[in-house]
């Protein structure tokens, strides 16, 4: 029998969760690093939100005080790691160059779109979250971890595969999103930015953070990967985002302490098996979820997106490692491995909590509050 | 269609150095997403994997033979290659590369295709 | 090192035969199980991969199941071009392999 994540678990390694308050938007700080000319081409053309203003439209808000604690999220979606919508979903029988689902880079030839077409759908991820805009549904309840605790043996594979950090998961992890929603976890993986840039795929009102987790599920309605890719709920990612905080993530650092061993892009090591719900946020019941894509080739469609409101803390010296150790293809640093936002074409975000009751200084302006979808769940 | 093909000397005497090639065609070595393994199998036994190269020449080899083993590429030849020192007779075996292909997806990773094999003889 | 030990390492049977080959891992494996089919002088041919995920243009006859320790692959009606040597392969720790199961004709 699954267990509802308890509220009052213990904070993850050393007091690295975020606080329980949502991030306000008064508390964002602004985008620095926007526009960033490393988001990969073709991307970068494709059309806004036309009914939303767009970065340089929003007020620049102070960030909090130090003695307030760690931001937490109140909307962030995630993204996921590539795989092959055809038969193989993974690189097996791809041969010709041009037809090598793993032969992309960020910020590079070739344009996306033109690896794999669905890169240039309508729904794609990662997305800026506006809890504004949000629609809160209370029919999303915590989400529900099983098996995530695992024991030092057997060991996991680590691997630098020149797009990411990537921990195989082995089987018997278990996550629902709600009743009827059942997912197995295959794999987490890891996106960051570089020396004082910001790196998360997920934006919360334009506010980039540090780098961001990933931990990719299939659901249990499909045997086999390909089978799930570009069909509804196939895939499902839980997504958080990572901060700085004044102590070490002990979770965490049981993956960072390995990295310089991987360094090289293809290289892979071993590591004792550890929490994997340890490298997530405590709190289960508050967060954003949307219906998105793979945010790296093929970018099939379908992924449902649930992206924590709390953030985990990591210190200083633990994202500085994260950022700077690896590196990927053509003797590069493997750094700033985000995509660019995508526009939401008119896809509403849910939130598990009222995200968009706040007393920011846009609540004076009229807003159009959006209706919970999923009110049938 | 990708396909791989052995070649090297098949008599090498004890103590010297084994050295092998794998030449790929269809493809290209330097698509990532591919490990490049080296495999074999002793006469009438089973299959001991030896290791592997990327195409940035990142290596991951097989503990109890890693102080002996060095694999190489050649991205502009499409080849990679298996030099195995200090051999004795139970070195003699059927060689075998192979691609291992990773869904970087899933995590998940197996060998296909393989070379048709070489036999290599360790005597005097 | 983890050891990956096949049973039985011989089996006779005929055409139309269910045939269940097992393969045991010496410790759980986090990762997953990939089945290799080989023919006297051929190289392997790999059936499945994922524990149970057949490879493209294998026919279905044959499937795989496990999870942990204990591995299976089934033949679900044995025909003559099956007759041949199988090995599992697990890529957890480093790469192992069985030492292999015949699939013999009865």
């Known amino acids: 029998q699954r267990l509802p994540r308890m509220q009052e678990d213990s904070p993850l390694g050393g007091g690295s969760s975020g606080e329980d308050d949502p991030l306000g938007e008064e508390d964002l700080p602004s985008e620095e690093d926007s526009p960033r000319e490393e988001d990969p081409p073709g991307e970068e053309d494709l059309p806004g939100e036309e009914d939303l203003p767009g970065e340089e439209d929003l007020p620049e808000v102070k960030p909090k005080s130090e003695e307030e604690g760690s931001l937490k999220l109140e909307d962030l979606p995630t993204v996921e790691a590539p795989g092959d919508p055809q038969e193989p979903q993974n690189n097996a029988h791809r041969d010709k160059e041009g037809d090598d689902q793993s032969h992309w880079r960020y910020g590079g030839d070739p344009p996306w779109p033109r690896v794999s077409p669905a890169c240039a759908g309508r729904f794609q991820s990662p997305v800026d979250i506006r809890p504004q805009l949000a629609a809160f549904c209370p029919a999303l309840r915590p989400l529900e971890l099983l098996g995530f605790q695992l024991p030092p043996l057997p060991e996991l594979r680590l691997r630098n595969n020149g797009h990411s950090v990537q921990l195989t998961l082995p089987p018997g992890l278990e996550m629902a999103l709600g009743p009827g929603r059942e997912y197995r976890a295959l794999q987490l993986h890891l996106h960051w930015g570089a020396a004082g840039r910001p790196g998360s795929e997920h934006t919360v009102e334009g506010h980039r953070f540090p780098a961001e987790i990933h931990v990719v599920h299939l659901s249990t309605a499909f045997a086999r990967v390909d089978e799930a890719l570009g069909r509804p709920g196939g895939l499902a990612v839980l997504a958080a985002f990572l901060e700085e905080g004044p102590e070490e993530n002990s979770a965490y650092e049981q993956l960072l302490s390995r990295l310089e061993e991987i360094a090289e892009e293809g290289s892979e090591t071993q590591v004792p098996g550890l929490d994997i719900s340890a490298l997530l946020p405590s709190d289960f019941s508050r967060y954003f979820q949307y219906e998105g894509s793979l945010t790296t080739p093929p970018c099939a469609q379908g992924v449902i997106w649930t992206v924590f409101n709390q953030t985990v803390m990591l210190s200083a010296k633990q994202l500085h490692t994260l950022s700077d150790t690896l590196w990927g293809p053509g003797d590069s640093r493997l750094q700033l491995n985000f995509r660019a936002t995508q526009p939401l074409n008119g896809r509403v975000i849910e939130a598990s909590f009222p995200a968009g009751v706040d007393s920011s200084p846009r609540a004076a302006e009229p807003v159009q509050l959006n209706s919970c979808l999923a009110a049938g769940d | 269609q990708v396909q791989l093909q052995e070649s090297g000397p098949g008599l090498v005497k004890p103590s010297q150095t084994l050295s092998l090639t794998c030449t790929v065609s269809g493809g290209s070595i330097s698509s990532g997403g591919y490990y490049w393994s080296w495999i074999r199998q002793h006469p009438g036994k089973g299959l001991e994997w030896i290791g592997y190269i990327y195409y940035s020449g990142s290596t991951y080899y097989n503990p109890s033979l890693k102080s002996r083993v060095t694999i190489s590429v050649d991205t502009s030849k499409n080849q990679f290659s298996l030099k195995l020192s200090s051999v004795t007779a139970a070195d003699t075996a059927v060689y075998y590369c192979a691609r291992e292909n990773y869904d970087i997806l899933t995590g998940f990773n197996w060998f296909d295709p393989w070379g048709q094999g070489t036999l290599v003889t360790v005597s005097s | 090192d983890i050891q990956m030990t096949q049973s039985p390492s011989s089996v006779s049977a005929s055409v139309g035969d269910r045939v269940t080959i097992t393969c045991r891992a010496s410790q759980g494996i986090s990762s997953w199980l990939a089945w290799y089919q080989q023919k006297p002088g051929k190289a392997p041919k790999v059936l499945i991969y994922s524990t149970s995920r057949l490879q493209s243009g294998v026919p279905s006859r044959f499937s795989g199941s496990g999870s942990g320790t204990d591995f299976t692959l089934t033949i679900s009606s044995l025909q003559p071009e099956d007759f041949a040597t199988y090995y599992c392969?697990?890529?957890?720790?480093?790469?192992?392999f069985g030492q292999g199961t015949k699939v013999e004709i009865k």
């Open positions: 392969q697990q890529a957890d720790s480093f790469r192992t």
